[in-house]
Interface confidence: low
């Protein structure tokens, strides 16, 4: 399991806002945000990334296919770019991913999982925003 404490959080935030968020919202299109309760949370920026990584790339019995989605590919690229040594930890994970069956239908559980992901990303951004607000407060 990768330790996310040394990532460049600002760069990850920029990538999320620029592309990943749009792909997540596209995946959820036609689904209201109120359709699912957020049951997964995170308590700090590295912890949020740990949970995001787990939900995005670890298959669950009712949703095994998220890792092939566009938002997942972009998430992987972002983490590889801004988290030192992340790529090396993902070689085994990638090999395991290739063995998974493709699913043609976006199941309700996948939609629920992506809804949880959106919540985790928002929590990550909000924590980061708080950090930036505090720095701004100190410098003015």
């Amino acid at each position: 399991m990768y330790d996310f404490t040394n990532c460049d959080f600002q760069k990850i935030e920029a990538d999320y806002l620029r592309t990943i968020s749009k792909d997540l919202i596209t995946y959820m299109s036609g689904t209201k945000s109120t359709d699912f309760n957020n049951t997964v949370s995170c308590s700090n920026r590295p912890h949020c990334l740990t949970e995001i990584q787990s939900l995005t790339f670890n298959p669950t019995p009712r949703c095994a296919s998220l890792a092939k989605e566009m938002f997942a590919r972009k998430t992987k690229a972002t983490l590889a770019l801004w988290c030192p040594g992340y790529s090396e930890t993902q070689i085994n994970a990638t090999q395991a991913m290739k063995k998974r069956r493709k699913r043609k239908v976006t199941t309700n559980k996948c939609l629920e999982q992506v809804s949880q992901l959106l919540g985790l990303w928002r929590r990550f951004i909000r924590t980061l925003l708080k950090k930036q607000l505090e720095h701004h407060h100190h410098h003015h």
Partner: antibody, heavy 117, light 107 residues
Framework: QVQLQQPGTELVKPGASVKMSCKAS????????MHWVKQRPGQGLEWIGV????????TYNQKFKGKATLTVDTSSSTAYMQLSSLTSEDSAVYYC??????????WGQGTTLTVSS | DIQMTQSPASLSASVGETVTITCRPT??????LAWYQQKQGKSPHLLVY???TLAEGVPSRFSGSGSGTQFSLKINSLQPEDFGIYYC?????????FGGGTKLEIK
């Protein structure tokens, strides 16, 4: 400079409730989460719960659900913790402490709660 | 919940000595560990977070190390003001939990 001001002592009777305060200054109150920690005499530290002052989102330690209620008043930059149905087991020092990434960089001086008839 | 086991529970050392306190969580917490010092009748004071990052104003004789399920706090060349109780705390997720404390006394 950052300060978290707490009243020194609270003396209450068993079965009653108490609402203790924590007034923050020296930083933007809504920027940090506010946590509460319990320390019984001669004992270690126990996390009670956390509140996000920006939206009053709370998370409690399962052990303190129903015992502690966390609230904030952003207009006065004050966090509150109410403890109900007090017993001698609740006699302790209670600290408020701020956090962003789960570790606590500033602490209040603590409020000593004595539950006695 | 993640339990944090600190050792030793207490130790005596002389000024100038080097001491090491260890902390073992019951599960992998990566680098999400903080160390605090508490003096009698005072609030805890942050020393280290993310296992090895020294908090602002903390002297360089303090150092944190470890990851996963094994962590340590090392204090080089003990000073009179270093005596007190030391606590570890995981900040991986809720509920945040603390170790039982290590009482560092003057020999």
């Amino acid at each position: 400079q950052v300060q978290l001001q707490q009243p020194g002592t609270e003396l209450v009777k068993p079965g009653a409730s108490v609402k203790m305060s924590c007034k923050a200054s020296g930083y933007t109150f809504t920027t940090y989460w506010m946590h509460w920690v319990k320390q019984r005499p001669g004992q270690g530290l126990e996390w009670i719960g956390v509140i996000d002052p920006s939206d009053s989102d709370t998370t409690y330690n399962q052990k303190f659900k129903g015992k502690a209620t966390l609230t904030v008043d952003t207009s006065s930059s004050t966090a509150y913790m109410q403890l109900s149905s007090l017993t001698s087991e609740d006699s302790a020092v209670y600290y408020c402490t701020r956090s962003l990434d789960g570790y606590y960089d500033y602490w209040g001086q603590g409020t000593t709660l004595t539950v006695s008839s | 919940d993640i339990q944090m086991t600190q050792s030793p529970a207490s130790l005596s050392a002389s000024v100038g000595e080097t001491v090491t306190i260890t902390c073992r969580p019951t599960e992998n917490i990566y680098s999400y560990l903080a160390w605090y010092q508490q003096k009698q009748g005072k609030s805890p004071h942050l020393l280290v977070y993310f296992a090895r990052t020294l908090a602002e104003g903390v002297p360089s004789r303090f150092s944190g190390s470890g990851s996963g399920t094994q962590f340590s706090l090392k204090i080089n060349s003990l000073q009179p003001e270093d005596f007190g109780i030391y606590y570890c705390q995981h900040h991986y997720g809720t509920p945040w939990t603390f170790g039982g404390g290590t009482k560092l006394e003057i020999k």
